[in-house]
Amino acid sequence: EPPTACREKQYLINSQCCSLCQPGQKLVSDCTEFTETECLPCGESEFLDTWNRETHCHQHKYCDPNLGLRVQQKGTSETDTICTCEEGWHCTSEACESCVLHRSCSPGFGVKQIATGVSDTICEPCPVGFFSNVSSAFEKCHPWTSCETKDLVVQQAGTNKTDVVCGPQDRLR
C-alpha cells in the first residue's frame, strides 16, 4: 500500500495536510492555508492517548467503590485511570469494570495460585499424601503428618480432606 497524501501525525482536510493534536490535547480548529491546527489541553479528569483530531477529550474511567473498585493508577491528560479491585476481590474482565470476591478452595482442594486484583484463585485437588480440611483462598494442600518421624504409627489413614491420625507403637510386640 503506497503512503497517503499526508504524512504521519497529519490528517487530510479540505485539500490540505493539517497537524494532528498531540496526546493530551483536543482539536479546536483545523488548519487553513494560512493558520496552523489549533489544539487545547484536555481538562481535569479528561484524556486523549493518541495523536488525534478529536473535538472532545475522553472522560477518565471512574473506579466505583460500590463495585469493589479502587484506583490502581491515576489518569493523566494522556492516559486513562486504571482500576483494580479491593483486597479479597478481583476483576470480572480485562477492562476491570466490576469485581467479584475471590473464590475459596473447598476442603480436599488447595490453593495452586493465590488470586490477584485481576485473576481469581486457582485451586487444585490435593494429591495422595496431602490434605486440606478448610475452605480457604490462601491455604495450600498440607502434607500428611509423618508418624514415623515422631516415632508413632498411623492409626487412621489420611484422605484429601483429613490428616492421618498417629498413635503410639504397639508395646506388646
Epitope: T4, S15, E33
Partner: antibody, heavy 116, light 107 residues
Framework: QVQLVQSGAEVKKPGASVKVSCKAS????????IEWVRQAPGQGLEWIGV????????NYNEKFKGRVTLTADKSISTAYMELSRLRSDDTAVYFC?????????WGQGTLVTVSS | DIQMTQSPSSLSASVGDRVTITCRAS??????LNWYQQKPGKAVKLLIS???RLHSGVPSRFSGSGSGTDYTLTISSLQPEDFATYFC?????????FGQGTKVEIK
C-alpha cells in the same frame, strides 16, 4: 501568479491508457497537494485522487483504484495522472487543481475521448 | 460517500438581482464546504472556501454561510460576468464530492 498548465487533448481506443500532465508555476510545488477531477460531457465533477508532490503520497477514489496512478516530478514541477483500461464512459475533461483550503487553482482541463 | 444535493439546478435572474444557491450534505461536514464558478472554455475558479472565506480576488458581492449539513452561496447583486455554473464541494471526508451544479442564466 499561480498557474497550472495541462497537456493537450487525447483520443484513445478502449483498453488503452492515457497520461495527462499538469505543469505548475508561481508557487512552491512541494508545498501544496495536487488534486485530480474529471467532468463527463454535460455532467458534474467527480474526484479522482490527490497526490502530495513532496514525497509522492496518494489517496485515490475507490472507484478508480487499480486503474489510476498519480505521480509527480519535483524537478520539473509537474504532476501526472495515468488512467488505464479506458472505457467509453471515461470520455471526459480531466482537471488538475492545487489544494490549500479547497481546490484553490485549476488547470484549463484536458479532453480525453475514448472511442473505437 | 457523502452526497451533495445542490438546488436549484438552474435559475434565471436579471442583473442586480440577489441570488441564493443552496447545498445540502448527506451528513455533517463541519463547515468544510467550498464553492466554485465554471464558465465555458475557462478554468474553474474557487469563490469561497470553508463555508465563508472569500478567495483572493473574488468580489465581495459573493458570500457564503451555513453549518452542519446546510450551506448557502449568495450573490448580493448579480453582475453580467456572474452568469455561469456554480458547484459546491465538501472537503470534510474522502472521497471529496461535488454538487451537481446550478446554472445561472440571464432572464
Amino acid at each position: 501568479q499561480v498557474q497550472l498548465v495541462q497537456s493537450g487533448a487525447e483520443v484513445k481506443k478502449p483498453g488503452a491508457s492515457v497520461k495527462v500532465s499538469c505543469k505548475a508555476s508561481g508557487y512552491g510545488f512541494t508545498n501544496y497537494l495536487i488534486e485530480w477531477v474529471r467532468q463527463a460531457p454535460g455532467q458534474g465533477l467527480e474526484w479522482i485522487g490527490v497526490i502530495n508532490p513532496g514525497y509522492g503520497g496518494v489517496n485515490y477514489n475507490e472507484k478508480f483504484k487499480g486503474r489510476v496512478t498519480l505521480t509527480a516530478d519535483k524537478s520539473i514541477s509537474t504532476a501526472y495522472m495515468e488512467l488505464s483500461r479506458l472505457r467509453s464512459d471515461d470520455t471526459a475533461v480531466y482537471f488538475c487543481a492545487r489544494g490549500g483550503s479547497g481546490f484553490a487553482f485549476w488547470g484549463q482541463g484536458t479532453l480525453v475521448t475514448v472511442s473505437s | 460517500d457523502i452526497q451533495m444535493t445542490q438546488s436549484p439546478s438552474s435559475l434565471s435572474a436579471s442583473v442586480g438581482d440577489r441570488v441564493t444557491i443552496t447545498c445540502r450534505a448527506s451528513q455533517d461536514i463541519s463547515n468544510h464546504l467550498n464553492w466554485y464558478q465554471q464558465k465555458p472554455g475557462k478554468a474553474v475558479k474557487l469563490l469561497i472556501s470553508s463555508t465563508s472565506r472569500l478567495h483572493s480576488g473574488v468580489p465581495s458581492r459573493f458570500s457564503g454561510s451555513g453549518s452542519g449539513t446546510d450551506y448557502t452561496l449568495t450573490i448580493s447583486s448579480l453582475q453580467p460576468e456572474d452568469f455561469a455554473t456554480y458547484f459546491c464541494q465538501q472537503g470534510n471526508t474522502l472521497p471529496w464530492t461535488f454538487g451537481q451544479g446550478t446554472k445561472v442564466e440571464i432572464k
